[in-house]
């Protein structure tokens, strides 16, 4: 059985303030069952950016339909970027449970925010 991998192909992404940023992420397997979550930063101080199954994340849109069977694309688009959004974003696979258990993280994508062109 092939080990699950979480792939974030871009090491860095740069966008202008006010624009949208696309952060790409794919998984190599649908197994085990469980959600993907996106975080900014690592460790206990990390910020939850998007949870596939719960919560309301108004600036975040999944690029692919998360309800589609066999979907392994967990890329997201964050709208209306501000300087406070700068940082490294991690796509993290969890195993379903109570609570969910963190299984595997992508390598991270650094988002840098350029000043809005005047």
């Amino acid at each position: 059985e092939e080990e699950l991998q979480v792939i974030q192909p871009e090491k860095s992404v740069s966008v202008a303030a006010g624009e949208s940023a696309t952060l790409n992420c794919t998984a190599t397997s649908l197994i085990p069952v469980g959600p993907i979550q996106w975080f900014r930063g690592v460790g206990p101080g990390r910020e939850l950016i998007y949870h596939q199954k719960e919560g309301h994340f108004p600036r975040v849109t999944p690029v692919s339909d998360p309800t589609k069977r066999n979907n392994m694309d967990f890329s997201i688009r964050i709208s209306n970027i501000t300087p406070a959004d700068a940082g490294t974003y991690y796509c993290v696979k969890f195993r379903k449970g109570s609570p969910d258990v963190e299984l595997k993280s992508g390598a991270g994508t650094e988002l840098s925010v350029r000043a809005k062109p005047s």
Epitope: G43, R46, E47, I49, E54, T82, A84
Partner: antibody, heavy 119, light 108 residues
Framework: DVQLVESGGGVVRPGESLRLSCAAS????????MNWVRQAPGEGLEWVSR????????DYADSVKGRFTISRDNSKNTLYLQMNSLRAEDTAVYYC????????????WGLGALVTVSS | ETVLTQSPATLSVSPGERATLSCRAS??????LAWHQQKPGQAPRLLIY???NRATGIPDRFSGSGSGTDFTLTISSPQTEDSAVYYC??????????FGGGTKVEIK
């Protein structure tokens, strides 16, 4: 309906401690950053502290840094503010406020808890 | 650190007479500005976010405009229940989150 209800306010002497609680309901508490904002009598709003959704990331206003500690218990849907070494200038109504998303405005406010520091 | 300056400090208008409140930021905050209403003895309530979007349940007599450093909250036809203090809040740069000093609106 989102509800935020503060408790734990009261009258204390300078140098004493107090712990405020904010009970949250009507939303997925563990998914949202939360804040404390205070308002001294007859004054405007002053942001005090923020905690991220998981509880491991905190920020403080310079005026309370080192004296106040924000925390949360996601299993109890409750936000806390531990206030130590209280000063007269900490007298205020303390509001808990939910963030719309992690990097955003405050979309819901509690009713507030009055803290009075007086000798 | 971004400073928000609100003017005027007090605004007295008659019912039905347009009220215009200003909030100026010391540096650009893009469109990341919210307005909150606080009636006497009550908690603040979100009115407008992202400079111009009305929050859920807010009457359409309230509108927001502006971007960058200059923002306006307009109450097109104020009612007596609109007597309150109005605060702007920026969330472009943080921490700290900053509020303006407030504008007190009195309906004559």
């Amino acid at each position: 309906d989102v509800q935020l209800v503060e408790s734990g306010g009261g009258v204390v002497r300078p140098g004493e401690s107090l712990r405020l609680s904010c009970a949250a309901s009507g939303f997925s508490f563990r998914s949202y950053a939360m804040n404390w904002v205070r308002q001294a009598p007859g004054e405007g709003l002053e942001w005090v502290s923020r905690i991220n959704s998981g509880g491991g990331g905190t920020d403080y206003a310079d005026s309370v840094k080192g004296r106040f500690t924000i925390s949360r218990d996601n299993s109890k849907n409750t936000l806390y503010l531990q206030m130590n070494s209280l000063r007269a200038e900490d007298t205020a109504v303390y509001y808990c406020a939910k963030q719309y998303d992690w990097n955003s405005f405050f979309d819901y406010w509690g009713l507030g808890a009055l803290v009075t520091v007086s000798s | 650190e971004t400073v928000l300056t609100q003017s005027p400090a007090t605004l007295s208008v008659s019912p039905g007479e347009r009220a215009t409140l200003s909030c100026r930021a010391s540096q650009t905050v893009g469109s990341k500005l919210a307005w909150h209403q606080q009636k006497p003895g009550q908690a603040p309530r979100l009115l407008i976010y992202d400079a111009s979007n009305r929050a859920t349940g807010i009457p359409d007599r309230f509108s927001g405009s502006g971007s960058g450093t200059d923002f306006t909250l307009t109450i097109s036809s104020p009612q007596t229940e609109d007597s309150a203090v109005y605060y702007c809040q920026q969330y472009y740069y943080w921490p700290p989150y900053r509020f303006g000093g407030g504008t007190k609106v009195e309906i004559k």
